[in-house]
Interface confidence: low
């Protein structure tokens, strides 16, 4: 046969197969311990392989951590009638390796979200809005939390692991009024251009324990609302003029940039001119020279022009190897 | 030209395991689910799975949990399924079947499809 | 799981004829619903897929048609290629599960 398209919408209610009969308001499922009072049900390292199909309907903090669920499917929490209350959702530790789309369908009340600590070899574009549209319903999460999602390498692929992250973060618009953001630890050498455009609300950015080496192509200019930037742990060698004016220019932020290996060379000048003036760093008294040789350990702070000088380019004449 | 091309047929006695290949071709292997798919003698099709090629992810029909495991080799751009503890209950067509593109959730109807593969099972 | 009850199970018309066959879902699918075609001895073929959307290459003589939780494959003027098995498949929520089937013979 032809090639179908694959165009469909998305079903205004997305049932679990599994689930066709409504949970009766008190059960608990089996391997979870549950409290009604505090609207929470726990399934902590039970080695579970699915989702409780099964969960109350009061439920409004689940913590599905250190299992081994591998595959979330579309509509994995969907049920009728739906999970209404759920708020609060901890995957963290469960060896989950792929997230499809639509897998956060119909839980309409999902403020946060935590996947860290899986080894996610494949997240769909659509994992966290739920459609293929060019702009879906706006997801309620307002916390998103990502840290160390990267496979090891063996599993990494050939697409980019940066660019896939991306994908899902600005799928539809969905996620214009996401607050929180946290992706350390994920080897990131880059941050895709686009990503920070899409999420306009962000108060909290957490990138520290990546490989970021640039910031030259990113932009900051419309968080607006961000208050928190972490950036330490990274490998960032300089801050240009570029981005250094764009975080002076947002209003309530504070950034953090320990454990960098700052080259103090003749590039440098404009940021250590901008550290000395600015409010916006925390800690900034502890950022230290990493490059050259002869700068290890200096302040940045207590550098002036003097002392940042760049080795005069030889003539390919003159130069030796 | 979209081919899904499957192993020859299978003559097993129960107990035994069994392992039938489907080896894709005219497409991006990893960009689109693949289906399982079990047909008995005269009767109708029955869903086993699907996996996503491109990280090995595979979602199971718990009917067929603990009987059937999918796997799939990126670099030949071949499926696997692999039918364990065989009876003559597991005697069927086999047929791999192409799903959904990868970013789309819905469309899991399977527009080609293997050949077939028949096992039969006997002492 | 949902499932999916087809009927008739089986059918004789003649060519030139106009045929329907129907399938009904236990639960609300939506247009979550493709239609297959099966020829004695050889591999199922998509023919419509969301309800009525024909995969292309499918003669305009077949349609799909969807009432609640009913679905229906009109056939109109019966071709000698069109005998053979038919079945229906949600593709809503795992499990996918296909209808039992539709003989259709030539009388």
């Known amino acids: 046969t032809s090639s179908a398209s694959s165009s469909s919408s998305s079903a205004p209610f997305l049932a679990s197969a599994a689930s066709a009969q409504p949970p009766l308001p008190d059960q608990c499922p089996a391997l979870c311990e549950c409290s009604e009072a505090a609207r929470t049900v726990k399934c902590v390292n039970r080695n579970l392989t699915e989702v409780p199909t099964d969960l109350p309907l009061y439920v409004r903090n689940l913590f599905l951590t250190g299992n081994q669920l591998a595959v979330l499917p579309a509509g994995a929490f969907a049920r009728r009638p739906p999970l209404a209350e759920l708020a609060a959702l901890n995957l963290s530790g469960s060896r989950l390796d792929e997230v499809r789309g639509g897998a956060f369908e119909h839980l309409p009340s999902l403020r946060q979200l935590d996947l860290s600590h899986n080894p996610l070899a494949y997240l769909s574009p659509f994992a966290f809005s739920g459609s293929n549209a060019s702009i879906s319903a706006p997801s309620p999460l307002v916390e998103l939390i990502l840290n160390h999602i990267v496979p090891p390498d063996d599993k990494r692929q050939n697409r980019s692991f940066e660019g896939m992250v991306a994908a899902a973060l600005v799928a539809g618009r969905a996620l214009q009024g996401l607050h929180l953001l946290e992706l350390a630890s994920n080897h990131f050498l880059y941050l895709p251009r686009d990503v920070l455009a899409q999420l306009p609300s962000l108060r909290y950015l957490d990138l520290s324990n990546n490989s970021l080496v640039s910031l030259t192509y990113v932009s900051f200019r419309n968080l607006t609302h961000l208050e928190s930037l972490h950036l330490e742990d990274n490998a960032l060698k300089v801050l240009h003029n570029g981005t250094l004016a764009e975080l002076q220019g947002l209003p309530h932020v504070r950034v953090f940039l320990d454990n960098n290996p700052w080259v103090c060379d003749c590039h440098m000048a404009d940021m250590v001119t901008w550290l000395k003036q600015t409010g916006v760093v925390q800690g900034k008294d502890r950022l230290t020279c990493a490059f050259p040789e002869k700068m290890r350990n200096r302040v940045l702070l207590e550098l002036n022009s003097a002392d940042l000088d760049c080795d005069p380019i030889l003539p390919p004449s003159l130069q030796t190897s | 030209e979209v081919q899904l091309q499957q192993s020859g047929p299978e003559l097993v006695k129960p107990g035994a395991s069994v392992k039938i290949s489907c080896k894709a071709s005219?497409?991006?292997?990893?960009?689109?689910?693949m289906n399982w798919v079990k047909q008995s003698h005269g009767k109708s099709l029955e869903w086993i799975g699907d996996i996503n090629p491109y990280s090995g992810g595979a979602t199971n029909n718990q009917k067929f949990k603990g009987k059937a495991t999918l796997t799939v080799d990126k670099s030949s751009s071949t499926a696997y399924i692999e039918l364990r503890s065989l009876t003559s209950e597991d005697s069927a067509v086999y047929f791999c079947?192409?799903?959904?593109?990868?970013?789309?959730?819905?469309?899991?109807?399977?527009?080609?499809w293997g050949q077939g593969t028949t096992l039969t099972v006997s002492s | 799981d949902i499932q999916m009850t087809q009927s008739p199970a089986s059918l004789s018309a003649s060519v030139g004829e106009t045929v329907t066959i129907t399938c009904r879902a236990s639960e609300n699918i939506y247009s979550y619903l493709a239609w297959y075609q099966q020829k004695q001895g050889k591999s199922p073929q998509l023919l419509v897929y969301n309800a009525k959307s024909l995969t292309e290459g499918v003669p305009s003589r077949f349609s799909g048609s969807r009432s609640g939780t009913q679905f229906s494959l009109k056939i109109n003027s019966l071709q000698p290629e069109d005998f053979g098995s038919y079945y229906c498949q949600h593709h809503y929520v795992t499990p996918w599960t296909f209808g039992g089937g539709t003989k259709l013979e030539i009388k």
């Open positions: 079947a192409r799903g959904s593109i990868y970013y789309d959730s819905t469309a899991n109807y399977f527009d080609y």
């Open positions: 005219g497409y991006t292997f990893t960009d689109y689910y």
